[in-house]
Interface confidence: low
């Protein structure tokens, strides 16, 4: 089966837009829009810090850490109100991702 131009293969994702807001000193806010072509029961998410199709139930329940969003060796924790997650590196550096 051939794909039309711009059509994603099932189970794959692409980042549609990327931007960084460096207006706040010492803090970088990165924004992204990800487009995925997922199988039934899946939805766009993040696995091992890369865009991926994940089980839709994870998104519905906001159990973000269940999609394994952090890199291997990092610890995942839910933010208050399940608004996102943090990835804590072994050295203690914390990377925060919020879902909007």
């Amino acid at each position: 089966q051939f794909l039309k131009e711009g059509q994603l293969a099932a189970g794959t994702c692409e980042i549609v837009t990327l931007d960084r807001d460096s207006s706040q000193p010492r803090r970088t806010i990165a924004r992204q829009t990800v487009k995925c072509s997922c199988f039934p029961g899946q939805i766009a998410g993040t696995t091992r810090a890369r865009p991926a199709c994940v089980d839709a139930r994870i998104i519905k329940t906001k159990q973000w850490c269940d999609m394994l969003p952090c890199l291997e060796g990092e610890g995942c924790d839910l933010l208050i109100n399940r608004s996102g997650w943090t990835c804590t590196q072994p050295g203690g550096r914390i990377k925060t991702t919020t879902v909007s």
């Epitope: 711009g6 794959t12 994702c13 990327l18 931007d19 960084r20 990165a30 969003p69 990835c87 991702t97």
Partner: antibody
Framework: QEQLVESGGRLVTPGTPLTLSCTAS????????MSWVRQAPGKGLEWIGI?????STDYASWAKGRFTISKTSTTVDLKITTPTTEDTATYFC?????????????????WGPGTLVTVSL | ELVMTQTPPSLSASVGETVRIRCLAS??????ISWYQQKPGKPPTLLIY???NLESGVPPRFSGSGSGSDYTLTIGGVQAEDAATYYC??????????????FGAGTNVEIK
């Protein structure tokens, strides 16, 4: 196993357009960002450009107008529009990866073995 | 235009020594750097991405560090098989101007 293979490299005369192709095995090219990189004999690596799954492209400033990256459902192609002797190099295609969620670092996780292009009179 | 200044151009080390290669970006690249090893006649292979993340299958003697515009690849306890040329790749993708990637000039590592 995920692999890339380039083809189309050969001896051409200056000014003769040449198109190189990159094919994948073990994964579906259509869903990935792909890049082309070249290396002149005895020299370092030079990034040429990138093509997105949507088909849009970005190029290094020096490569704009000199190269065109395009794709089909099974290949990613690089056209050297008007080759000069300075374009003699090994050309690599590479799969682009990048981790997201807290940054947009871009890197190449799979490379092809390269294909040699020689531009000579 | 992003410029990646890689130093030193070449170095010689004995087995077991620690080797450090530095790349200085012309602007803050937000950890958008990766490191590659290339041996003669072969394509490069990924060692480190996102400044400090070790690619799967790469020996742990390789490590990356740095932030902002200053980054370092360290080979702790260099081995004979580490003789190669090493390259950094810097870049950041913005929605406004697209992707801009630049390689450093390379560092040739010789093992005595």
């Amino acid at each position: 196993q995920e692999q890339l293979v380039e083809s189309g490299g050969r001896l051409v005369t200056p000014g003769t357009p040449l198109t190189l192709s990159c094919t994948a095995s073990g994964f579906f090219l259509s869903g990935y960002y792909m890049s082309w990189v070249r290396q002149a004999p005895g020299k370092g690596l030079e990034w040429i450009g990138i093509i997105y799954p949507s088909g849009s492209t970005d190029y290094a400033s020096w490569a704009k107008g000199r190269f065109t990256i395009s794709k089909t459902s099974t290949t990613v192609d690089l056209k050297i529009t008007t080759p000069t002797t300075e374009d003699t190099a090994t050309y690599f295609c590479a799969r682009v990866a990048g981790y997201v969620g807290y940054g947009y670092e871009t890197f190449f996780d799979i490379w092809g073995p390269g294909t040699l292009v020689t531009v000579s009179l | 235009e992003l410029v990646m200044t890689q130093t030193p151009p070449s170095l010689s080390a004995s087995v077991g020594e620690t080797v450090r290669i530095r790349c200085l970006a012309s602007e803050d690249i937000y950890s958008g750097i990766s490191w590659y090893q290339q041996k003669p006649g072969k394509p490069p292979t990924l060692l480190i991405y996102g400044a400090s993340n070790l690619e799967s299958g790469v020996p742990p003697r390789f490590s990356g560090s740095g932030s902002g515009s200053d980054y370092t690849l360290t080979i702790g306890g260099v081995q004979a098989e580490d003789a190669a040329t090493y390259y950094c790749l810097g870049g950041v993708t913005y929605s406004s101007t697209g992707t801009h990637l630049t390689f450093g000039a390379g560092t040739n590592v010789e093992i005595k």
